[in-house]
Interface confidence: low
């Protein structure tokens, strides 16, 4: 590529809107999935809008497996928080499943077949990493 | 983006090596899948190397569904041909499944869980579109 041009996203990532997404090919617990994303200068998936949710639902429509996202909470009395500490906006989606369970490792959210579920963070699942797309020439 | 810079691949496509790949979110027969790719200025997946195969196997590792690729043959006495008319290189992979079956619509190849299978082209499946990445400034 010409030197002053930079791709919006690295190879193997999907560019959508302002972000790049990588669907993991390995199955890990939530913390390891988070570390994997961090090693790629990214974070676990954060859904900011219904448009984001629509895209992700479409992107995983051909999978029946669960994917960790960057949403977790310490116990049922705590709010669902994204990795950056911001709360889940209730109009986006409702977390289903084991929402009132308490796990020593915390409760983490995964997306599967378009719905979001609560589960023990220690379980292994695929994951979705996300980082800002490079939308300027470098 | 700066005017003289063009992304290697459009949004929602995955850039890998010299190509862009799009995993369909809808399920169609082989011919309709081919038309869908053509409408996006692309073709159905063509695997040219073991590296290509490794990438595709990794990219669909979290799906248990079949994906049409651009490989078909009229009947068992014909060779497997890619859409551009080139033959399947035997060292790449072996087509499994209904290889000796004859179907009115022809026999088409799909990839599922890393292996390639023969099936009736009239059946519905997901698909993978592919086109050349734009690796130069425009």
């Amino acid at each position: 590529r010409v030197a002053n041009c930079s791709a919006p996203c690295p190879q193997d990532w999907i560019w959508h809107g302002e972000n790049c997404y990588l669907f993991s090919s390995g199955s890990f617990n939530w913390e390891n999935s988070q570390e994997k994303c961090l090693s790629l200068d990214a974070k676990l998936l954060k859904i900011n809008s219904t448009a984001d949710l629509d895209f992700i639902q479409q992107a995983i429509s051909y999978s029946s497996f669960p994917f960790w996202m960057g949403l977790s909470r310490r116990n049922p009395s705590y709010p669902w928080l994204w990795e950056d500490g911001s709360p889940l906006m209730p109009h986006l989606f409702r977390v289903r499943g084991a929402v009132s369970q308490t796990y020593p490792s915390g409760t983490c959210a995964y997306i599967q077949r378009g719905a979001v579920y609560a589960e023990n963070c220690i379980l292994a699942a695929f994951s979705i990493c996300q980082k800002k797309a490079n939308l300027r020439a470098q | 983006r700066v005017a003289n810079c063009s992304a290697p691949c459009p949004q929602d496509w995955i850039w890998h090596g010299e190509n862009c790949y799009l995993f369909s979110s809808g399920s169609f027969n082989w011919e309709n899948s081919q038309e869908k790719c053509l409408s996006l200025d692309a073709k159905l997946l063509k695997i040219n190397s073991t590296a290509d195969l490794d990438f595709i196997q990794q990219a669909i590792s979290y799906s248990s569904f079949p994906f049409w690729m651009g490989l078909s043959r009229r009947n068992p006495s014909y060779p497997w041909l890619w859409e551009d008319g080139s033959p399947l290189m035997p060292h790449l992979f072996r087509v499994r499944g209904a290889v000796s079956q004859t179907y009115p619509s022809g026999t088409c190849a799909y990839i599922q869980r890393g292996a390639v299978y023969a099936e009736n082209c009239i059946l519905a499946a997901f698909s993978i579109c592919q086109k050349k990445a734009n690796l130069r400034a425009q």
């Epitope: 049922p76 709010p79 709360p87 209730p90 109009h91 977390v95 009132s100 308490t102 | -």
Partner: antibody, heavy 129, light 111 residues
């Protein structure tokens, strides 16, 4: 600091409806989850319903479902609780209350953790023929 | 009958320590939902005393403390004072009822 100002006392006949208001100041209503709690004379506190951050909607205690409606007028930052088909057992003080007011979080999701730290003074509703 | 149980009354002399228990189940306190405690003086609205099991809002004396274990929680008041005479309520969330629940209340009498 959040303050909740409730409407005045009401006397109603059995079968009628009552609508109690609760005006928020110091915050906007959309930043808070409003709940309604009642207390019959000489009895304990009874949760009637309120905004649930998990669902992003108002939920009602099973006992009151079908009889109670909780609404919000965000233009005036006022919450309302309407109870229909009144009977003598509904004679009580009705409180509006919100979590996380004093904590200043302004984040509805913290409700389960903070408890209801700001209360209105209560509205006495008497149901008598 | 409340799904969260408190003793109807407790009493203690000034300066003494008293505890009030709050017993729930696996669908509320035992499910991990936090417990909050309220104090209600006669003729006034309830006041939050303890939130999140053991945290005191600003202005609440450190004579009041809360704890939680398993399916139950307790409120402890040390150095009992005459002005502590009031009704005390615990509260949690119940996932099977999909709503908040209060204990039946405990009347504290300072002898």
């Amino acid at each position: 600091q959040v303050q909740l100002v409730q409407s005045g006392a009401e006397v109603k006949k059995p079968g009628a409806s009552v609508k109690v208001s609760c005006k928020v100041s110091g915050y906007t209503l959309t930043e808070l989850s409003m709940h309604w709690v009642r207390q019959a004379p000489g009895k304990g506190l009874e949760w009637m319903g309120g905004f649930d951050p998990e669902d992003g909607e108002t939920i009602y205690a099973q006992k009151f479902q079908g009889r109670v409606t909780m609404t919000e007028d965000t233009s005036t930052d006022t919450a309302y609780m309407e109870l229909s088909s009144l009977r003598s057992e509904d004679t009580a003080v009705y409180y509006c209350a919100t979590p996380n007011g004093q904590q200043g979080k302004g984040v509805r999701g913290w409700d389960y953790y903070y408890g209801m730290d700001v209360w209105g003074r209560g509205t006495t509703v008497t149901v008598s023929s | 009958q409340s799904v969260v149980t408190q003793p109807p009354s407790v009493s203690g002399a000034p300066g003494q320590r008293v505890t009030i228990s709050c017993t729930g189940s696996s669908s509320n306190i035992g499910a991990g939902y936090d417990v909050h405690w309220y104090q209600q003086l006669p003729g006034t609205a309830p006041k939050l005393l303890i939130y999140g099991n053991s945290n005191r809002p600003s202005g609440v004396p450190d004579r009041f403390s809360g704890s939680k274990s398993g399916t139950s929680a307790s409120l402890a008041i040390t150095g009992l004072q005459a002005e502590d005479e009031a009704d005390y309520y615990c509260q949690s969330y119940d996932s099977s009822l999909s709503g908040w629940v209060f204990g039946g209340g405990t009347k504290l009498t300072v002898l």
